[in-house]
């Protein structure tokens, strides 16, 4: 996702993105909440393709690990949180059935707020 | 992206998520910046699967369309911005070559800041 810094902008939450292989992932959670094994390769018409996922999560080394940047601290507590999305992947379930399923992957780092009580 | 409301939380930016078909998308931008046609169906071992994408974008009807929630307005200008990620999809390029390519899809709504000058 585009880097806001190039426009003289800052993100409220610092994130880090990377390409993750199925070998790195090994398992994932599918849409029914079950744990499935992510297969390393996908058969295509002329051979096989490695399964890759583009993942984004909150940067544990970033400035915003203690809270979000730019928040009105008088009124709000804040936290940067990794959010997820679904992508289709070739997987194997606990009964050894192979199939295409939607799995959850990390896709962003967003800021969540809770109101400060009793100031 | 999990709903923060269940924990009494608010998002700094309001988002909306939906399942998008290849028929809805029609085209997408691939990793080299070229426009490709997204094919409606993917051949699998015993038939075909519709290509679906789980997309998240900033909610144009949301409270945060004028700026992010909870920002310290004395010091910052803010904007909710849809960010993108890459997912693999079966596509056809301008030369009618069909293949699996990583395409950009909307995956999140994040807050970006610019510092207020000359207060």
């Amino acid at each position: 996702h585009s880097d806001p810094a190039r426009r003289g902008e800052l993100s409220v939450c610092d994130s880090i993105s990377e390409w993750v292989t199925a070998a790195d992932k090994k398992t994932a959670v599918d849409m029914s909440g079950g744990t499935v094994t992510v297969l390393e390769k996908v058969p295509v018409s002329k051979g096989q393709l490695k399964q890759y996922f583009y993942e984004t999560k909150c940067n544990p080394m970033g400035y915003t690990k203690e809270g979000c940047r730019g928040i009105d601290k008088r009124h709000w507590n804040s936290q940067c949180r990794t959010t997820q999305s679904y992508v289709r992947a070739l997987t194997m379930d606990s009964k050894k059935r192979i199939g295409w399923r939607f799995i959850r992957i990390d896709t962003s780092c967003v800021c969540t707020l809770t109101i400060k009580r009793g100031r | 992206h999990s709903d923060p409301a269940r924990r009494g939380e608010l998002s700094v930016c309001d988002s909306i998520s939906e399942w998008v078909t290849a028929a809805d998308k029609k085209t997408a931008v691939d990793m080299s910046g070229g426009t490709v046609t997204v094919l409606e169906k993917v051949p699998v071992s015993k038939g075909q699967l519709k290509q679906y994408f789980y997309e998240t974008k900033c909610n144009p009807m949301g409270y945060t369309k004028e700026g992010c929630r909870g920002i310290d307005k004395r010091h910052w200008n803010s904007q909710c911005r849809t960010t993108q990620s890459y997912v693999r999809a079966l596509t056809m390029d301008s030369k009618k070559r069909i293949g699996w390519r990583f395409i950009r899809i909307d995956t999140s709504c994040v807050c970006t800041l610019t510092i207020k000058r000359g207060r």
């Epitope: 849409m31 029914s32 909440g33 059935r97 | 992206h1 999990s2 709903d3 998520s17 015993k46 519709k50």
Partner: antibody, heavy 115, light 108 residues
Framework: DVQLVESGGGVVRPGESLRLSCTAS????????MTWVRQPPGKGLELVSH???????YYADSVKGRITVSRDNSNGTLYLQMNSLRVEDTAVYYC?????????WGLGILVTVSS | EIVLTQSPGTLSLSPGERATLTCRAS??????LAWYQQKPGQAPRLLIY???RRATGIPDRFSGSGSGTDFTLTINRLEPEDFAVYYC??????????FGGGTKVEIK
């Protein structure tokens, strides 16, 4: 015990709106996909809309653009906002728990669209 | 979308007999198929999922079989409470999941 209770049905005229609710109890609502299925009088079952745990919505072609599904995880409620209703939307509307198959269903609520 | 065709439309049997209901998919759905029972004025009730797995609390006289495009729901020794409408549903090509048109099992 898992319970799903629909409300908000009734009789409306074509073109009008209605908002159905489904109140869930007995499970962690936020962890489950939820689905609206309808059944016109004397007919079979038809998927209307679906919302996954992460909040993403799917709509059947027959209702796309007229219906909005949403969920409030804080109070365990699923909603179906139906606009520009048509006579062919007349049905019993069920909410069901799940993404793929449905172990738990509400009792259903009747929506009648008639001039 | 995947079309499910159920047959027969109506099955007339006596209590104690065996009922065999079929569901055919327009393309392979693997084993991602469920069966439901619906009685008049009631919500559907899940009987079988993943083609052959019985849902919680379902008696063992109900069994499911098949994979790919052809599926069968068998009810051994029909009980009076088994007379109802039965629907199959696929969740292989999701979304959208689709239902069959139903088979009515009636008392002969």
């Amino acid at each position: 015990d898992v319970q799903l209770v629909e409300s908000g049905g009734g009789v409306v005229r074509p073109g009008e709106s209605l908002r159905l609710s489904c109140t869930a109890s007995g499970f962690d609502f936020s962890r489950y996909g939820m689905t609206w299925v309808r059944q016109p009088p004397g007919k079979g079952l038809e998927l209307v809309s679906h919302i996954v745990d992460l909040g993403g919505a799917y709509y059947a072609d027959s209702v796309k653009g007229r219906i909005t599904v949403s969920r409030d995880n804080s109070n365990g409620t699923l909603y179906l906002q139906m606009n520009s209703l048509r006579v062919e939307d007349t049905a019993v509307y069920y909410c069901a728990r799940g993404n793929t198959f449905f172990e738990y269903w509400g009792l259903g609520i009747l929506v009648t669209v008639s001039s | 979308e995947i079309v499910l065709t159920q047959s027969p439309g109506t099955l007339s049997l006596s209590p104690g007999e065996r009922a065999t209901l079929t569901c055919r998919a327009s393309q392979s759905v693997g084993s991602d198929l469920a069966w439901y029972q619906q009685k008049p004025g009631q919500a559907p009730r899940l009987l079988i999922y993943d083609s052959s797995r019985r849902a919680t609390g379902i008696p063992d006289r109900f069994s499911g079989s098949g994979s790919g495009t052809d599926f069968t729901l068998t009810i051994n020794r029909l009980e009076p409470e088994d007379f109802a409408v039965y629907y199959c549903q696929q969740y292989y090509d999701w979304p959208p999941l689709t239902f069959g048109g139903g088979t009515k099992v009636e008392i002969k």
